[in-house]
């Protein structure tokens, strides 16, 4: 199809080389007046618009996603072409930052319902450059955690080193929701709930004596209980002796509770106690079986091929630690009798 | 508790304007968006538009867009909204009402209002 | 503007009657749908969030459902203060808008 009649957005992504981030593209279908398919919320200049879905369909995922490539070759379908872009509903989520995300994409609906809706497309020339070191040192991070109950605040990451008195007007979505009266570089959340959690995107316009774009970045937001006072407590085995079969396969889990830490390293394996000697076993990888705000609950098993008459003289200690301390429990075979 | 207290009952001459107070108590008052919105008589619910009381930015609804102004003063805790250019179809109930969640949010619901002014427009 | 159709505009019914009040978007609103009653002379009351949630407060025998276009407001068995207009609104984008409401008379 004929991209010159799409309305064109220019966007910078200035990523940070020592920090994992991601980055969105909106598909910013124009206004109603340019065609009927096209939906908008009608608002005032000074206003910035929603980006969401268009008259065409209530299905929020009926936009088509193209890249153009520079040497000039056919547009390219997206989900196609490029694993590391993913669309979601309205919205295309770059995984992974570099210079090579830079080109222009280009949105519009799957279905043209009529003649006018050939133009109704956008296209987004997309700059992606590193940051450099003369930029600011301690911009905003990318992923900022929230303390569920009490105060914090957001930053945009391309703003956090202006004072709000200097910062130019900030445009903010929330899971690709426009948040209509946050304007500010930093929004300051005075009591955090769960729902704080999500992914914040900011936007400003930076211009010069040619041409204006978007500056965006993209925040993932986590709201977090603070880090636990406790060491971990072990759930099972409770008990401190076990009746088995001699000669049969044995498997002995260990269960551990392990409180929120912000910088979280569990440690949970098996050893085994012989008289004077004591000895860790290699065992198969823990996994996490329950996770929530406040705690996960981490197990890891021991297996025995088969239980012989020496294992009936050892202990099997299960240890868990975590930043504060931690906790063993030992396990003695006894022979199942009749 | 929480509470929301208007000003009282005014009258209007066309072509004039109006300016509604809603005075906040019993929670932080930057906290939480407020929004307006109003009921001609036998009529439904119209929003009118949301104001964020910590820094004061407003969205308003595309039809009163240029006649209707939202402000708000932190050190009373009062969001104000004022209407121009009255016309006879203005004569309603006006209502602020509180949004359910800590900004920054959704809206997720108006979860407490004030008890409404009327603005009656006549000549 | 998302449009708001709300039907029907008014019911009659009698106390322990089980009511049920449907709200159209005239696009997808995902769950986006509040639920308010009104009684005369007074201000609006808050009674469903996101579409089925009950508010804090509200009686057990209110509760929502629906998601996308197409929501209800259900009322298991009418009671005498029951008898109100009741309104939904929707909240996925501005400007936030309201259905025609629905009033509840006593039969």
């Known amino acids: 199809f004929n991209i010159s009649g799409c309305s064109t957005k220019k966007l910078l992504w200035t990523y940070s080389t020592r920090s994992e981030e991601e980055f969105v593209l909106f598909c910013d279908l124009p206004e109603p007046q340019k065609s009927h398919f096209c939906h908008r919320n009608r608002l005032s200049p000074k206003q910035v618009p929603e980006h969401l879905p268009f008259m065409g369909s209530n299905d929020l995922s009926d936009v088509q996603w193209y890249q153009q490539p520079s040497n000039g070759d056919p547009l390219e379908d997206i989900r196609k072409s490029y694993p590391h872009i993913i669309q979601d509903k309205c919205t295309l989520h770059f995984l992974t930052p570099g210079v090579n995300n830079s080109g222009s994409y280009i949105c519009r609906p799957k279905m043209i319902k009529s003649p006018y809706d050939v133009a109704c497309c956008v296209k987004m020339i997309l700059e992606v450059k590193p940051q450099t070191n003369a930029s600011c040192e301690y911009s905003a991070s990318h992923k900022q955690d929230l303390l569920l109950g009490s105060t914090g605040s957001i930053s945009c990451p391309s703003l956090s080193c202006q004072s709000d008195a200097q910062s130019p007007a900030v445009t903010w979505y929330k899971n690709g929701k426009l948040l209509s009266v946050e304007r500010s570089n930093r929004i300051v959340v005075d009591e955090v709930y769960d729902y704080h959690q999500g992914t914040y995107v900011c936007d400003y316009t930076q211009s010069d004596t040619v041409s204006s774009w978007t500056v965006r970045a993209v925040v993932q937001v986590r709201t977090i209980v603070g880090d636990t006072k406790l060491k971990p407590d072990i759930l099972d085995p409770v008990e401190d002796t076990l009746e088995v079969e001699l000669g049969k396969p044995l498997t002995i889990s260990c269960k551990a509770r392990f409180g929120f830490e912000r910088v979280f390293n569990p440690v949970i394996k098996w050893y085994i106690k012989d008289s004077d000697l004591e000895w860790e076993v290699s065992v198969p990888e823990a996994k996490s079986i329950k996770s929530t705000l406040k705690d996960e609950i981490i197990e890891r098993n021991i297996i025995l091929e088969k239980v012989t008459q020496r294992d009936l003289r050892r202990k099997f200690v299960c240890f868990v630690q975590n930043s504060i301390g931690n906790t063993t429990q030992s396990v003695q075979l006894k022979e199942k009798r009749g | 508790q929480v509470q929301l207290v208007q000003s009282g009952a005014e009258v209007k001459k066309p072509g004039a304007s109006v300016k509604v107070s809603c005075k906040a108590s019993?929670?932080?008052?930057?906290?939480?968006?407020m929004h307006w919105v109003r009921q001609a008589p036998g009529q439904g619910l119209e929003w009118m538009g949301i104001?964020?009381?910590?820094?004061?930015?407003?969205t308003y609804a595309q039809k009163f867009q240029g006649r209707v102004t939202m402000t708000r003063d932190t050190s009373t805790s009062t969001v104000y909204m004022e209407l121009s250019s009255l016309r006879s179809e203005d004569t309603a109930v006006y209502y602020c009402a509180k949004e359910g969640r800590v900004s920054p949010t959704d809206y997720y619901g108006m979860d407490v209002w004030g008890q409404g002014t009327t603005v009656t427009v006549s000549s | 503007d998302i449009q708001m159709t709300q039907s029907p505009s008014s019911l009659s019914a009698s106390v322990g009657d089980r009511v049920t009040i449907t709200c159209r978007a005239s696009?997808?609103?995902?769950?986006?749908l509040n639920w308010y009653q009104q009684k005369p002379g007074k201000a609006p009351k808050l009674l469903i969030y996101d579409a089925s949630s009950l508010q804090s407060g509200v009686p057990s025998r209110f509760s929502g459902s629906g998601s996308g276009t197409d929501f209800t407001l259900t009322i298991s068995s009418l009671q005498p203060e029951d008898f109100a207009t009741y309104y939904c609104q929707q909240s996925y984008s501005t400007p936030l808008t309201f259905g025609g409401g629905t009033k509840v008379e006593i039969k």
């Open positions: 019993g929670y932080t008052f930057t906290s939480y968006y």
């Open positions: 696009q997808s609103i995902s769950s986006y």
């Open positions: 104001i964020n009381p910590r820094g004061g930015y407003t």
